[in-house]
């Protein structure tokens, strides 16, 4: 029932106002102007973004599960926002913990050599039967973001005349026959079809793909960043290890592919104030327009400290304009040499290319522990994962609308294949909510000084444990 407010007595009017003030505490507000879509609705729950007809409906909404859940989340968010700033001793302890973890969990040069040997061995085995192919190591082994137990990612480069599915079927047969590998299986229905096997000597799991050029380009980018920015590798390792502890890094179980965590760290370092990493495209490029960013394609790493880009106009309108121009030119009988000259000029303008630096000129002075805490805070409180896209190419924050991607869960753009959301494997709302909840627990855990014996906490101890980084060193502060 909609109340005719003009007929109310003073008592009733005050009663209505009081009820509305109470509702505001529950994030339900009276609409100044009614929405044209919901003409009967007088109120809006700003927390759940739901239109409500009247006071009775509002009281009913308050009792709903989702509203209660959102209220709790809001309360937790404000609690997290009001956590005191960490002391320098606390940050120093965190820095030590992250460095220790990177040493403890990351791969050593010896581990890398073992992985490179696996590729060399496999190259010999496969090239005996497929001499025109070559094998390359990619992924976390090459970027040095691998944990000790991480899979070995191997890609097969093959000539254009070869058929991709046939090639993988042949590789499956070759590896099955070899005594060097056990548990050889195919996973051709995966997003990236692979042959999976275990290297008998090292017991490491190998995932063999073919023609996975984009992944190799991303690997080169992340590896180069690891070399030029000292904080990058330990932060990624800590982040990956945390994700592994929380069971959110398994793509096959609806989690996030592990290299996404590296892109998330990269994005955070670009977005923090002041930034520690530059974006890959920007105003330093003459004529760059963020609205037309997809006309600039990233092409790979040069000199280990630059990313190469090319300008190719993909705008339909521009193509149509050029087509019309060409048609007009064709209709006019003109001197052939002159026509070719103007065409060449127009092509030159369209085929711009250049390189962008991977680092900023000013050296980083921020302690690693502070960055770890900021990273968790960024994804817990500052960056709306559901609303925006993690895009490492430009400084501007991309909305889902910009990409035409649905407003759900996590979106991470592949810098080399910009139509691909590399976090699309996280496709369950429940898993997404779990990820968000893990971020909150981790930020709370690392933001609060920890005692050696463990803090008395109201948090679920099992959850709290998952927030920890290193099994050896508890984070403590004096």
């Amino acid at each position: 029932t909609v109340i005719d407010e003009s007929a109310l007595t003073p008592e009733q009017r005050l009663g209505l106002k009081q009820a509305e003030e109470r509702l505001e505490r529950d994030h339900i507000f009276r609409l100044e102007k009614r929405s044209p879509e919901y003409t009967n609705c007088r109120y809006l729950c700003k927390l759940c973004l739901i239109h409500i007809e009247n006071i009775q409906g509002a009281h009913k909404h308050i009792k709903e599960k989702r509203h209660k859940k959102n209220i709790l989340e809001k309360q937790e968010e404000s609690e997290l926002r009001s956590l005191p700033s960490p002391s320098s001793a606390h940050l120093a302890a965190l820095s030590v913990a992250v460095v220790e973890l990177a040493k403890e969990q990351g791969i050593t040069d010896d581990d890398l050599r073992i992985r490179q040997d696996i590729v060399e061995e496999m190259s010999k085995v496969i090239m005996t039967f497929l001499p025109e192919c070559s094998l390359r190591l990619y992924g976390s082994s090459l970027t040095k973001f691998a944990l000790k137990s991480s899979d070995v990612n191997i890609d097969i480069k093959f000539p254009p005349k070869m058929n991709h599915p046939d090639l993988l079927i042949q590789v499956l047969g070759i590896l099955k026959k070899s005594a060097l590998y056990i548990d050889v299986e195919s996973d051709f229905h995966a997003k990236v079809p692979v042959v999976v096997c275990k290297d008998r000597k090292s017991a490491l799991l190998c995932r063999v793909s073919a023609g996975n050029d984009m992944a190799c380009l991303t690997t080169d980018l992340l590896a180069a960043l690891g070399k030029v920015e000292p904080v990058f590798t330990p932060l990624v390792l800590a982040f990956r290890y945390w994700a592994k502890l929380c069971y959110i890094d398994s793509q096959t179980d609806g989690g996030i592919p592990s290299y996404c965590f590296a892109l998330m760290v990269m994005f955070f370092l670009q977005q923090r104030k002041p930034p520690l990493l530059p974006c890959l495209l920007g105003s330093w490029i003459e004529g760059f327009d963020p609205k037309r960013m997809d006309d600039f394609q990233l092409k790979g790493i040069v000199e280990e400290k630059f990313v190469k880009w090319e300008y190719n106009s993909s705008s339909a309108t521009e193509k149509n304009l050029i087509a019309d121009e060409n048609k007009a030119k064709a209709d006019e009988p003109k001197d052939d040499t002159k026509k070719t000259e103007t065409d060449n000029q127009s092509n030159a303008a369209k085929a711009k290319h250049g390189k962008s630096p991977l680092t900023l000129e000013a050296p980083n002075q921020v302690p690693l522990g502070q960055l770890w805490l900021e990273l968790l805070k960024f994804y817990t409180l500052d960056f709306a994962l559901e609303e925006y896209v993690i895009c490492v190419r430009i400084q501007d924050i991309l909305t889902r609308e910009n990409k035409n991607w649905p407003k759900r869960r996590i979106a991470i753009e592949d810098p080399f294949s910009v139509k691909r959301n590399v976090a699309r494997s996280l496709n369950s709302q429940l898993v997404y909510e779990y990820v968000v909840e893990r971020f909150r627990a981790a930020y709370r855990y690392f933001a609060c000084p920890q005692k050696k014996g463990g803090n008395k906490s109201t948090m679920d101890p099992k959850k709290k444990e998952k927030g920890k980084l290193s099994s050896k060193k508890p984070v403590k502060s004096d």
């Epitope: 008592e11 009733q12 005050l14 009663g15 209505l16 106002k17 009081q18 009820a19 003030e21 109470r22 505001e24 006071i55 009775q56 009281h59």
Partner: nanobody, 118 residues
Framework: QVQLQESGGGLVQAGGSLRLSCAAS????????MGWYRQAPGKERELVAG???????YYADSVKGRFTISRDNAKNTVYLQMNSLKPEDTAVYYC????????????WGQGTQVTVSS
């Protein structure tokens, strides 16, 4: 159960001032509109002033500019500051606490006598 206890009534000369207080016991003070009613002999009880949790106020035309209602949510108390009193303000003043939603219910105080002599 909410209990309301008024104080501050008494005899005052015309043009004088009085301050009424009403202390509410019970933990749900914030749910209620708090107000003051009065009843003069042989007349109906009328709403003099009311105030919501957020401080929205109402005054009867006869007292506008002379009376001020305020509430202290921390102390569960509502006040009525009465200035420039007139003989026609003589009445028993009742403190009231009420809600309209989800349904109407009202709690009343015992009342306090205010007499304005000319």
């Amino acid at each position: 159960q909410v209990q309301l206890q008024e104080s501050g009534g008494g005899l005052v000369q015309a043009g004088g001032s009085l301050r009424l207080s009403c202390a509410a016991s019970g933990t749900i003070f914030t749910y209620f509109v708090m107000g003051w009613y009065r009843q003069a002999p042989g007349k109906e009880r009328e709403l003099v002033a009311g105030i919501t949790l957020g401080g929205t106020t109402y005054y009867a035309d006869s007292v506008k500019g002379r009376f001020t209602i305020s509430r202290d949510n921390a102390k569960n108390t509502v006040y009525l500051q009465m200035n420039s009193l007139k003989p026609e303000d003589t009445a028993v003043y009742y403190c009231a606490a009420w809600v309209e939603y989800p349904r109407r219910y009202v709690y009343w105080g015992q009342g306090t006598q205010v007499t304005v002599s000319s």
